[in-house]
């Protein structure tokens, strides 16, 4: 079709695709009317001078997954109409200066998954119309000042999965149109104050999986349009009180997998669009009053796998919309009777794997819509009379792995459990720990030498198991029984994600699924 090379396929839509290991050089002659050219999975190792000279109408050029390690500076000469150029997944270590000269229409440049060691201001100085620049998955150790100064129209910049140890506060200063900046999986230890000040249109900032220890108080103060902020899996030990105060558009904030020890009241400044907050895998020891009070629309709050030993009675003030609360795998011994009082719409709460010795009788008093309560693996010996009586929607209650004391005081609980047996699930039932003569026997059928009338077990609503809560990729919750699933790193681009296997798909979330949302 207008001279289609034998190694290629050419469509009537002016699209040419050349693939296969037998290709060792750019095939010729290419159809003069080609608008899209893909050279994929070949053994081409270099691009010489002007291999595309006769296809000046080309709009998109993909040279991906080859053995390409060397490009002559004039390789892309005469491609003034080119809007999309991908050299991803090759073996490029060096980019010649002037390689992109003359590509005046270029909007997307993909250089990801190569072996690039450095970039220089001169590399992109001609690319004034560039909107997207992908440099993730290379070996970049630093970005020189001025590298992006000419890319004033850039809207997406990905520098993830490199070896960056520091960022100059001036490197992004001219990128006023940038909407997405990804710096995940580098070796950044801190971000200088002012680094993001020029990014007034930024909507997504990905800083996860670095080694960031401290955040400057005003780091995000100019980023009023920020919608997604990823800070998970760093070494952040504290949050300056005002760091999140001017992010009214934020709808995603990840802070899990850090070293946070405390959260100050109101730390999460007004964020009316934030619906989920994952804080698992930190070192939080206590929750003060009003710590989440600005998060009026929050639906899911994950605080599992911390070291929380104290929760102030007003810690959850303001969370009127909360549906799911995960507090499992902490160090809680006692809970104030009013701690959940404001959570009128709560449906699921996970408190398993703590050290709870007792619960106040009014702990769930105002939380009438509760569907799932996880209390397994605590230090509970008994529960107050009527603690669950008003919970008409309760369909999953987990009480196993507690040291239940099966004396006559256990009768009210035992009778309630008899009436509500289906809610306990079939996996594991609560068993007596004391006295010694009944240790290991089921709490539900134990004989405590008091006559108990036979009871009819009524139907309870049939709901699926309760929802899961994030816990951690590395530490499965061994008290649950489930099938193997995979955990992965969050917020990546779509290639080469590390996969870690664990043995429980609920370990991270800490609940099964009474509510599915």
């Amino acid at each position: 079709y207008h001279g289609c090379p034998s190694e290629c396929t050419c469509s009537r839509a002016s699209q040419v695709e050349c693939t296969g290991a037998r290709i060792v050089a750019v095939p010729t002659p290419l159809p003069w009317n080609a608008m899209s050219l893909q050279i994929l999975n070949t053994h081409i190792t270099e691009l010489n001078e002007s291999p595309f000279l006769n296809i000046s109408a080309l709009i998109a050029l993909r040279i991906e997954k080859n053995e390409l390690s060397r490009i002559t500076p004039g390789a892309f000469r005469n491609l003034g109409s080119l809007r999309y150029l991908s050299l991803a997944n090759n073996k490029l270590q060096v980019l010649p200066i002037g390689l992109f000269q003359g590509l005046d229409s270029l909007e997307s440049l993909l250089l990801s998954s190569n072996q690039l060691l450095q970039i220089q201001p001169a590399h992109f100085s001609q690319c004034s119309n560039l909107k997207e620049l992908q440099l993730h998955g290379n070996h970049l150790e630093y970005i020189p000042d001025g590298a992006f100064d000419h890319l004033v129209g850039l809207t997406k910049l990905n520098l993830g999965k490199n070896s960056l140890t520091h960022i100059s506060p001036r490197v992004f200063q001219h990128l006023g149109n940038l909407q997405v900046l990804r710096l995940y999986e580098n070796r950044l230890t801190d971000i200088p104050m002012g680094t993001f000040d020029g990014l007034v249109n930024l909507q997504e900032l990905a800083l996860q999986q670095n080694q960031i220890g401290l955040l400057s108080p005003g780091l995000f103060h100019n980023n009023h349009n920020l919608q997604r902020l990823y800070l998970s899996n760093n070494h952040i030990s504290q949050l300056p009180p005002s760091v999140f105060m001017q992010l009214p558009q934020l709808n995603r904030l990840t802070l899990f997998g850090n070293s946070l020890k405390e959260l100050s009241p109101g730390i999460f400044g007004p964020m009316p669009n934030l619906r989920e907050l994952w804080l698992y895998d930190n070192h939080i020891s206590s929750l003060p009053d009003n710590v989440f009070s600005n998060l009026r629309q929050l639906q899911v709050l994950i605080l599992s796998r911390n070291q929380i030993s104290f929760i102030s009675p007003g810690a959850f003030n303001g969370l009127t919309e909360l549906r799911e609360l995960s507090l499992h795998t902490n160090a809680l011994q006692d809970l104030d009777g009013n701690v959940f009082r404001m959570l009128a719409n709560l449906q699921n709460i996970s408190l398993q794997n703590n050290r709870l010795r007792q619960l106040p009788g009014n702990i769930f008093a105002n939380v009438n819509g509760l569907m799932a309560i996880q209390l397994q693996n605590n230090q509970l010996e008994n529960l107050p009379l009527g603690i669950f009586d008003h919970l008409g929607k309760l369909c999953e209650l987990r009480l196993y792995d507690n040291p239940w004391r099966c004396d006559s005081d256990i009768l009210p609980l035992r009778n309630w459990l008899l009436l509500n047996q289906p809610r306990l699930g079939t996996d594991t039932v609560p068993v007596c720990f004391s006295p010694a003569n009944v240790r290991g026997q089921s709490l539900i059928i134990i004989n405590v030498n008091v006559a108990v009338p036979s009871v009819h077990v009524p139907e309870v609503p049939s709901y699926p198991e309760t929802p899961w809560y994030p816990d951690t990729p590395s530490y499965p919750d061994t008290t649950s029984v489930s099938s193997t699933t995979e955990l992965t790193s969050p917020v990546e681009d779509y290639t080469d994600l590390t996969t870690i296997q664990v043995t429980d798909d609920r370990s991270v979330w800490g609940m099964t699924q009474a509510q599915s949302g």
């Epitope: 899961w468 699933t485 955990l487 779509y494």
Partner: antibody, heavy 119, light 110 residues
Framework: EVQLVQSGAEVKKPGSSVKVSCKAS????????IHWVKQAPGQGLEWIGL????????NYNQKFKGKATLTVDTSTTTAYMEMSSLRSEDTAVYYC????????????WGQGTTVTVSS | DIVLTQSPDSLAVSLGERATINCRAS??????????MHWYQQKPGQPPKLLIK???SLESGVPDRFSGSGSGTDFTLTISSLQAEDVAVYYC????????FGGGTKVEIK
């Protein structure tokens, strides 16, 4: 551009299994929930369950527990739904869809995969 | 499970006229801030398309002739001026508990 591209139509014998795939592109796969929805011929929509690709955690509609298994492969940004012990009433179009937060609406849908169970 | 009942089952409206579809839930799906009710449009041979989320929030890219209202158990989808391309089946969905859909309302041109 956000896209969910599903695998092609399947014809299966009763008692067998089928695995439908949903390839995601144009968004950060590990940051969204993936839902699965059934639509039997001439019928309405029925929610099967969801999976969160970051941890592989799942929620199921009780009706489909034991029938459907939801998994993901983050390396290929693909979600899967496997249906086992197929019966004629499993004949339907199955959709995958994306949700930003757990309780949010499903804002992007795959084109659907028709599964026909017939002896 | 929460049952969603849509009415009418089908609706014939003249071009340019208003179309109103109702959805009643068997229990409240609202809080003081949110109603966990969403609306979808499905054309023959196509997947559903999100129109309205959280009862009244118009999805990006959806024409503003579509609007949603209601709270508690009663919700309404309104097409202010029916266009030919609006011929479809419309579904409500709740995400308060286990997600369920209404039975659908078929909208045709009179």
């Amino acid at each position: 551009e956000v896209q969910l591209v599903q695998s092609g139509a399947e014809v299966k014998k009763p008692g067998s299994s089928v695995k439908v795939s949903c390839k995601a592109s144009g968004f950060t796969f590990t940051d969204y929930y993936i839902h699965w929805v059934k639509q039997a011929p001439g019928q309405g929509l029925e929610w099967i369950g969801l999976v969160h690709p970051y941890i592989g955690g799942t929620n199921y509609n009780q009706k489909f527990k034991g029938k459907a298994t939801l998994t993901v492969d983050t390396s290929t940004t693909t979600a899967y739904m496997e249906m086992s012990s197929l019966r004629s009433e499993d004949t339907a179009v199955y959709y995958c869809a994306r949700g930003d937060n757990k309780y949010d609406a499903m804002d992007y849908w795959g084109q659907g995969t028709t599964v026909t169970v017939s002896s | 499970d929460i049952v969603l009942t849509q009415s009418p089952d089908s609706l014939a409206v003249s071009l340019g006229e208003r179309a109103t579809i109702n959805c009643r839930a068997s229990q409240s799906v609202s809080t003081s801030s949110y109603s966990y009710m969403h609306w979808y449009q499905q054309k023959p041979g196509q997947p559903p398309k999100l129109l309205i989320k959280y009862a009244s929030s118009l999805e990006s890219g959806v024409p503003d002739r579509f609007s949603g209202s209601g709270s508690g158990t009663d919700f309404t989808l309104t097409i202010s001026s029916l266009q030919a391309e609006d011929v479809a089946v419309y579904y409500c969905e709740q995400s308060w508990e286990i997600r369920t859909f209404g039975g659908g309302t078929k909208v045709e041109i009179k």
